[in-house]
Interface confidence: low
Amino acid sequence: ESLGTEQRVVGRAAEVPGPEPGQQEQLVFGSGDAVELSCPPPGGGPMGPTVWVKDGTGLVPSERVLVGPQRLQVLNASHEDSGAYSCRQRLTQRVLCHFSVRVTDAPSSGDDEDGEDEAEDTGVDTGAPYWTRPERMDKKLLAVPAANTVRFRCPAAGNPTPSISWLKNGREFRGEHRIGGIKLRHQQWSLVMESVVPSDRGNYTCVVENKFGSIRQTYTLDVLERSPHRPILQAGLPANQTAVLGSDVEFHCKVYSDAQPHIQWLKHVEVNGSKVGPDGTPYVTVLKTAGANTTDKELEVLSLHNVTFEDAGEYTCLAGNSIGFSHHSAWLVVLPAEEELVEADEAGSVYAG
C-alpha cells in the first residue's frame, strides 16, 4: 500500500508533489488556502488520461476547482474541501496518488496567499523596509510534530525592494545546514523546511533590509517527537442501528493514527453454536478489508444493502497499525417490514421490541 505516511502543515498555494503510488499523503491547509495537489506520472513516463476523485466521487471543474491531468487546484479552501483525494488512471481506475486533505481554521504556519506578498511598488519614492502583513506574524512560537513541513513568512515591502536573509540561532542559515535542505522563496518572503526533525528546533530570524534600513522578526520552532500509539477510534462509532427488512444501512468508523492504519470490518458469527474459538478469539467473517485500490476513507464506512434478518448481529471496526490494534463494535437489529407487521398484528401476533 505505501512507503509511509507523512503529515504536513503546508502553506497557501503550496504545491504538494505526488506520493509514491499507494502512499497516502496527509496534508493540512488553512481555511482560505489554495490547495494544490500534484501527481506526476510514475517513473516520469506517459500517464494517459486521468481523473481526480474526492471521497470516491469524480471532481467537476469549476471556477474554484481547477483540474489538470497532473495537478488539482482548489481555490479558497474551506472545511467542506477536507477529504480523501486521489488521482486515478481514467481507463483502469488505478490510483496513482492519494492525498488526505484537512482544512483547518488556523492559517498554515502564518502563511499568506500566493503572490499576495510579492514585492510591490508602493508609490513611495524611497523608504525603509516595513512589514506588509504584521497581523500574520503574531505566532512567534511554532510547535509542530516531527515530519511536518514548516514555513516561516516575513512579508515585507520597501523602496527599493528589500532583500531577505535568514538566521538560525543568530547565525547565517543555509540549505547545507540541515538534512533535506531548505527552500527560500524570496518572492514570498518565506523559508520552508520539509520533514522537520528535533535538530531543527531553535530560533529562526528573518532579516529584511535595504539601503534605508533593516527590520527583523524571530520565530521559535519546537519539534514535537510523536509518541507512537495504536489507532484511536472515535467514541460512539460505529453506532447501534435498527433497520427495516430490505433497507440500506451504513456503519461508520473514524480512525485516527499516526502510523498507516489497516482497517477491517468484521461480522461476528457462530460456529457450532459458539461465538468464540478455543483460544477465546471471536469467530468473525471479514466483510471489508484494505485492497490495492481502496482508500482509508472508503474503509471508514461499511454499507449493507437490502438487509435481511441474517444481517442482524454484531459488527466490529478493527483498526491496526505497527503499534497495535483497536476495535469498536455495534449491533444491527433488523425489523420486519411495516406491511408484515400489520399482517402479523391482524393475525394476533405480538412483536416485542
Epitope: 498507516q260 489497516h262 484494505a290 485492497g291 491496526g320 505497527s322
Partner: antibody, heavy 126, light 111 residues
Framework: QVQLVQSGAEVKKPGASVKVSCKAS????????MHWVRQAPGQGLEWMGW????????NYAQKFQGRVTMTRDTSISTAYMELSSLRSEDTAVYYC???????????????????WGQGTLVTVSS | DIALTQPASVSGSPGQSITISCTGT?????????VSWYQQHPGKAPKLMIY???NRPSGVSNRFSGSKSGNTASLTISGLQAEDEADYYC??????????FGGGTKLTVLG
C-alpha cells in the same frame, strides 16, 4: 488430507490471457483464504494476491492490479487466477496456496501458506 | 520487487549448523512477529518450516529454528543433513505491500 490440484501447463502468446485453476479438497473450501504466488525460472517467490472464497472478496498486489482477476466456484471448490496482457516476463510457475488463517480469523496479517498446489508452468512466447 | 534481503547462498558440512538471515525494515520484519520460512526443493512447491518468527508446524524437525532481532530474522538449521539442501525463502507481513518474500537463499550441503 488437504490437497490443492492445479491445472496443467500452458503456452501463450504475448498479449493473450491465461486462466489457471486450483481445485481444493480435504477441507471446507470457503473457510480459508486462497493466495496466488508465482516464481519465474531461477527466481524467487512473488505474491500476487488473495481471494476470500467465502465472500469472493479479493486483494491484488499493486504490481498486478488491472491485469489479474481471481475468482472462485464454491460448488466445485475451485479457485481461478486469470492474468491478461501476457508478456514474456510473465513466464513462471504459478502456485495457489492456502493460508492458515481462515475467513473467520480475527487478524489477516498472520499469513501462513500451509498448503500449496503443485504449480502450473505458464510459458509466454511468440 | 524483492523487499526482504537474503544471502544468495550459504553452505555447510553435514552435522554443522548454518544460519540464513532475512533483513527487512520496521514496516515488515521489524514491525511484526509474522515472519515465516519456506523450504523449496528443485521442481517442488515450497513447504512451511517456521511461522510467527520461531514456531514450527507439526512434522517439521526441531533442527529448524527461527529468531528475530530488530529488522532481521534468522533461520538456523542445526545438525545439517543432505536432505536440507534446498532453497529457503523468508516471508513477512508488510504494512504497505501486505505480503513480501525474500529473494531466496540456496543452501548447499557439502560433500
Amino acid at each position: 488430507q488437504v490437497q490443492l490440484v492445479q491445472s496443467g501447463a500452458e503456452v501463450k502468446k504475448p498479449g493473450a490471457s491465461v486462466k489457471v485453476s486450483c481445485k481444493a479438497s480435504g477441507y471446507t473450501f470457503t473457510s480459508y483464504y486462497m493466495h496466488w504466488v508465482r516464481q519465474a525460472p531461477g527466481q524467487g517467490l512473488e505474491w500476487m494476491g488473495w481471494i476470500n472464497p467465502n465472500s469472493g472478496g479479493t486483494n491484488y498486489a499493486q504490481k498486478f492490479q488491472g491485469r489479474v482477476t481471481m475468482t472462485r466456484d464454491t460448488s466445485i471448490s475451485t479457485a481461478y487466477m486469470e492474468l491478461s496482457s501476457l508478456r514474456s516476463e510473465d513466464t513462471a510457475v504459478y502456485y495457489c496456496a492456502r493460508s492458515m488463517n481462515s475467513t473467520m480469523y480475527w487478524y489477516l496479517r498472520r499469513v501462513l501458506f500451509d498448503h500449496w498446489g503443485q504449480g502450473t508452468l505458464v510459458t509466454v512466447s511468440s | 520487487d524483492i523487499a526482504l534481503t537474503q544471502p544468495a547462498s550459504v553452505s555447510g558440512s553435514p552435522g554443522q549448523s548454518i544460519t540464513i538471515s532475512c533483513t527487512g525494515t520496521s514496516s515488515d520484519v521489524g514491525g511484526y512477529n509474522y515472519v515465516s520460512w519456506y523450504q523449496q526443493h528443485p521442481g517442488k512447491a515450497p513447504k512451511l518450516m517456521i511461522y510467527d518468527v520461531s514456531n514450527r508446524p507439526s512434522g517439521v524437525s526441531n533442527r529448524f529454528s527461527g529468531s528475530k532481532s530488530g529488522n532481521t530474522a534468522s533461520l538456523t538449521i542445526s545438525g545439517l543433513q543432505a536432505e536440507d539442501e534446498a532453497d529457503y525463502y523468508c516471508q513477512s507481513y508488510d504494512m504497505y505491500n501486505y505480503i513480501v518474500f525474500g529473494g531466496g537463499t540456496k543452501l548447499t550441503v557439502l560433500g
